[in-house]
């Protein structure tokens, strides 16, 4: 039968080395066997490159395209093929569709004055445009009480957050995760980092009296 795209490709760039496109077919499809996504930078002399998609779900395909360090002027021509049949054609400008890389190595350390120090790593090297553009959202939640969670926006430069132990329930187990956003690029949020868990052993002052 005829091959059709139900939801056309939606693409995001990490603005350093990879762009990812995802789309949905109108029926379950073996993406790698049946489809190819070709991409070519709109730049004199550029070559046509081919991405072999993988299945994310039965009818959802995803393609990861290794691209060079992105710059604002870059525009790619994208063509989705099923054999010789062109299913979809469009253009993609990485700088206008940024999804930052996930922050890494989230750790929690006891700090002076009954505070916890949450630290993570900026996912971009210092020379990349996004390194100095990221702001973060940290989600802290009680593992045993879904109602007990807090969201912190970290808008300053350093990838750290100081958390007063007194703002959390004593003796409870908490998990934290972090994601990133690049405001000047009007990006989407990155994926959440893996969670890190710790026990909040802060004793309220009442227990000392």
């Amino acid at each position: 039968g005829s091959v059709k795209v139900l939801h056309e490709p939606s693409c995001f760039s990490d603005y350093i080395s990879t762009s990812v496109c995802q789309w949905k077919m109108d029926h379950p499809t073996n993406c790698s066997a049946e489809l190819r996504l070709s991409y070519q930078l709109d730049f004199m002399g550029s070559e046509n490159h081919t991405c072999v998609p993988e299945n994310r779900e039965d009818s959802v395909c995803v393609c990861s395209m290794p691209i060079d360090d992105a710059v604002e002027a870059d525009v790619y021509q994208l063509d989705l093929w099923a054999g010789q049949q062109l299913l979809w054609s469009g253009s993609f400008q990485p700088s206008k569709h940024v999804k930052p890389r996930t922050p890494g190595n989230l750790t929690v350390h006891p700090n002076i004055s009954h505070t916890w120090l949450l630290m993570w790593t900026n996912p971009y090297p210092t020379e990349n445009h996004l390194h100095s553009e990221l702001t973060y959202m940290v989600n802290v939640s009680n593992d045993n009480d879904p109602e007990d969670f807090k969201v912190y926006n970290v808008t300053y430069m350093g990838p750290t957050l100081r958390l007063a132990a007194s703002t959390l329930k004593s003796g409870a187990s908490y998990s934290a995760r972090v994601r990133a956003w690049a405001q000047t690029y009007n990006s989407t949020w990155s994926d959440w980092s893996p969670s890190t868990t710790w026990l909040n052993y802060y004793e309220p002052w009442e227990q000392h009296l």
């Epitope: 930078l41 004199m44 002399g45 550029s46 046509n48 691209i67 710059v71 870059d74």
Partner: antibody, heavy 125, light 112 residues
Framework: EVQLVESGGDLVKPGGSLRLSCVAS????????MTWVRQAPGKGLQWVSL????????YYADAVKGRFTISRDNAKNTLYLQMNSLRAEDTAVYYC??????????????????WGQGTLVTVSS | DIVMTQTPLSLSVSPGETASISCRSS???????????LDWYLQKPGQSPQGLIY???KRASGVPDRFSGSGSGTDFTLRISRVEANDTGVYYC?????????FGQGTKLEIK
Amino acid sequence: EVQLVESGGDLVKPGGSLRLSCVASGFTFRDYAMTWVRQAPGKGLQWVSLINGSGGKTYYADAVKGRFTISRDNAKNTLYLQMNSLRAEDTAVYYCAVDRLTKTVRPQYYGLWSWGQGTLVTVSS
Amino acid sequence: DIVMTQTPLSLSVSPGETASISCRSSQSLLYSIGYNYLDWYLQKPGQSPQGLIYLGSKRASGVPDRFSGSGSGTDFTLRISRVEANDTGVYYCMQGLQSPLTFGQGTKLEIK
């Protein structure tokens, strides 16, 4: 050592055809775009055409579009320029030159970093 | 098409002096930060052209540091310091950003 050797230049009548060749050595030919540049007697340099490394994309100056065809044979490390419907104003020394590295997603640019010795095309009745 | 305009069209300089050639483009040649697609070439009498500078300011392999390129966007300059008799020839700027590639008219450098 990079070498580019052009050949095929000749005296031809207006309306005639000619095929220029440029044999390359000393670098990975298929990885680079190649360019033809010409120079009319006593005049400046004029870009003619460019072909990317795979041969999949070509570009032409308006003055030669529809008359000239650039092509390459990567197995033979050879660049070609097929010139049809030649005119007196096509009289020039034709140079081939190595252009940008095109195997990367964004071509890496080093200018026209190596040139051949040129071959003379004369169009006259 | 991008038009390239060179000034002056001829230049006479004494050995040891500095020669400067200007090149102006009708559109910006800045693709991204640090990437101006502007080259400089030298054609010595009776020879093929040779690359001197690419991307506005990067010296081609084997080119002495007496040759330097500067500028961004639409205005560029080639400077040749401590000019030698061997520097005589015609200097061309060229934009490599978009088709058609275009050259300046050329500047003839004569050593006094």
